[in-house]
């Protein structure tokens, strides 16, 4: 328990005075927060929170979902915490199966344990398949398992959190990793035709094709030296993972002489931008 020099506000005191507590499913959780300036208890698991304004937190029949961090806070904003594991052989993992990873970043598989005394807390591939050889992870019983430096190749990887218990493996529910690619090159842009010669009243239609690793690429048709918003229509396709194509079609239904000029198809992503132009000449 914390000790502070006299005169300074001190953090609350929690009974039982330990950082971690293990209780069995069905048993009572009884936590006492002692502080003259007690404000609240906060319970947190899988980043969700609940509050209790009573200084004694009592859960008569503990369930696996009562596993988590219990924090007592006083009026000075000082706090103290205890982590409670509710050991339930039927529910070894608490899970949130939403799993997204940004390429080259770490991502957390949220499967905290309800029993810290199991062994070999790790990730396993679904249906007995091995994990990618370069997949590295760091287990944390209170948070889950952190996958380090997500690769594009891990997209739609099927995973289980796993522990060993009484000689066998116990698997969590399935997680499907969805990888958002990092932009490592500018978009590829092309235009259906580099120049057009039309008579007044004819329809002008030009298509720009934008290719990139994801639909997050931004694209627009612009008229050079003009801020006017051009009307464009889109079609898009995913040709498998990380191979996205968009066609942006610009149409002027009845071209006029003053529509003549240079039109630019511009695309950008977080790596950089690219553009391609087409020239329209309208004669009367």
């Amino acid at each position: 328990q914390p000790s502070v020099s006299p005169g300074e506000p001190s953090p609350p005191s929690i009974h039982p005075g330990k950082s971690d507590l293990i209780v069995r499913v069905g048993d009572e959780i009884r936590l006492l927060c002692t502080d003259p300036g007690f404000v609240k208890w906060t319970f947190e698991i899988l980043d969700e929170t609940n509050e209790n304004k009573q200084n004694e937190w009592i859960t008569e029949k503990a369930e696996a979902t009562n596993t988590g961090k219990y924090t007592c806070t006083n009026k000075h904003g000082l706090s103290n915490s205890i982590y409670v594991f509710v050991r339930d052989p039927a529910k070894l993992f608490l899970v949130d199966r939403s799993l997204y990873g940004k390429e080259d970043n770490d991502t957390l598989v949220r499967c905290p344990l309800t029993d810290p005394e199991v062994t070999n807390y790790s990730l396993k591939g679904c249906q007995g398949k091995p994990l990618p050889k370069d997949l590295r992870f760091i287990p944390d019983p209170k948070a889950g398992i952190m996958i380090k430096s997500v690769k594009r190749a891990y997209h739609r990887l099927c995973l289980h959190c796993s522990v060993d218990q009484e000689g066998g493996s116990v698997l969590s529910e399935k997680f499907i990793l969805k990888v958002r690619p990092a932009f490592k090159a500018v978009p590829v842009v092309s235009v259906s035709k580099a120049s057009y010669l039309l008579r007044e009243g004819e329809e002008f239609t030009v298509t720009c094709t934008i290719k990139d690793v994801s639909s997050s690429v931004y694209s627009t048709w612009k008229r050079e030296n003009s801020q006017t918003k051009l009307q464009e229509k889109y079609n898009s396709w995913h040709h498998g993972d990380f191979n996205y194509e968009r066609q942006a079609t610009l149409t002027i239904s009845s071209a006029r002489v003053n529509d003549s000029g240079v039109f630019m198809c511009y695309a950008n992503n977080t790596f950089g931008s690219a553009n391609v132009t087409t020239t329209l000449e309208v004669v009367d």
């Epitope: 980043d47 969700e48 609940n50 939403s98 099927c158 639909s215």
Partner: antibody, heavy 117, light 111 residues
């Protein structure tokens, strides 16, 4: 305990822009993705896009790219959506929804945006 | 984009009987046996409320009268028996692939 608070209504003029808020409580704001959904009588429910937890990356439905911009303020646990160049077609109810365990488990009450001169 | 087609568009069912709503996806929403299909209920002036997630899992607090089934492209929401409070519009939604999409909705009326 989880709550998503949205303003009830916004009245805006054509051509203007509107920035609506979604204030989150009851969970760690930076740990969950926030989605935005548009609802009109004609088009039903349409997914606008998502702002991902942690780093604030966004992904948009192509239909709303350039029309909607999603941002978040971690310090106030608030997600925002700005819609620009408003027309009558943007009149709708806009919801924020928190993604939890693969689904939209929590929704705001919605903001009714009316575009009128 | 994955298109979700709900049928019927509207449905009138007598109190105590069974209501069945179908949702067909233009392509599979399954990955490794997980169907990324969810069902929501919406009443006028309220946001959608989650009923069923991952095709067949009952959301906490939702009555067991609601059930979901199906895989790949064909999904069903069943309410059995129907109660007066179930009058609402029901939507299916997929989040297997961007952009996430919703069905057009089925309006349930209780006779």
């Amino acid at each position: 305990q989880v709550q998503l608070q949205q303003p009830g209504a916004e009245l805006v003029k054509p051509g203007a822009s509107v920035k609506m808020s979604c204030k989150a409580s009851g969970y760690t704001f930076t740990s969950y993705n926030m989605h935005w959904v548009k609802q009109t009588p004609g088009q039903g429910l349409e997914w606008i896009g998502v702002i991902y937890s942690g780093n604030g990356d966004t992904s948009y439905n192509q239909k709303f790219k350039g029309k909607a911009t999603l941002t978040a303020d971690k310090s106030s646990s608030t997600a925002y959506m700005q819609i620009n160049s408003l027309t009558s077609e943007d009149s709708a109810v806009y919801y924020c929804a928190r993604e939890r365990d693969t689904r939209f488990g929590n929704w705001g009450q919605g903001t009714l945006v009316t575009v009128s001169a | 984009n994955i298109v979700l087609t709900q049928s019927p568009a509207s449905l009138a069912v007598s109190l105590g009987l069974r209501a069945t709503i179908s949702c067909r996806a233009s392509e599979s929403v399954d990955i490794y046996g997980n169907s990324f299909m969810h069902w929501y209920q919406q009443k006028p002036g309220q946001p959608p409320k989650l009923l069923i997630y991952l095709a067949s899992n009952l959301e906490s607090g939702v009555p067991a009268r609601f059930s979901g089934s199906g895989s790949r492209t064909d999904f069903t929401l069943t309410i059995d028996p129907v109660e007066a409070d179930d009058a609402a519009t029901y939507y299916c939604q997929q989040n297997n692939e961007d952009p996430y999409t919703f069905g057009g909705g089925t309006k349930l009326e209780i006779k």
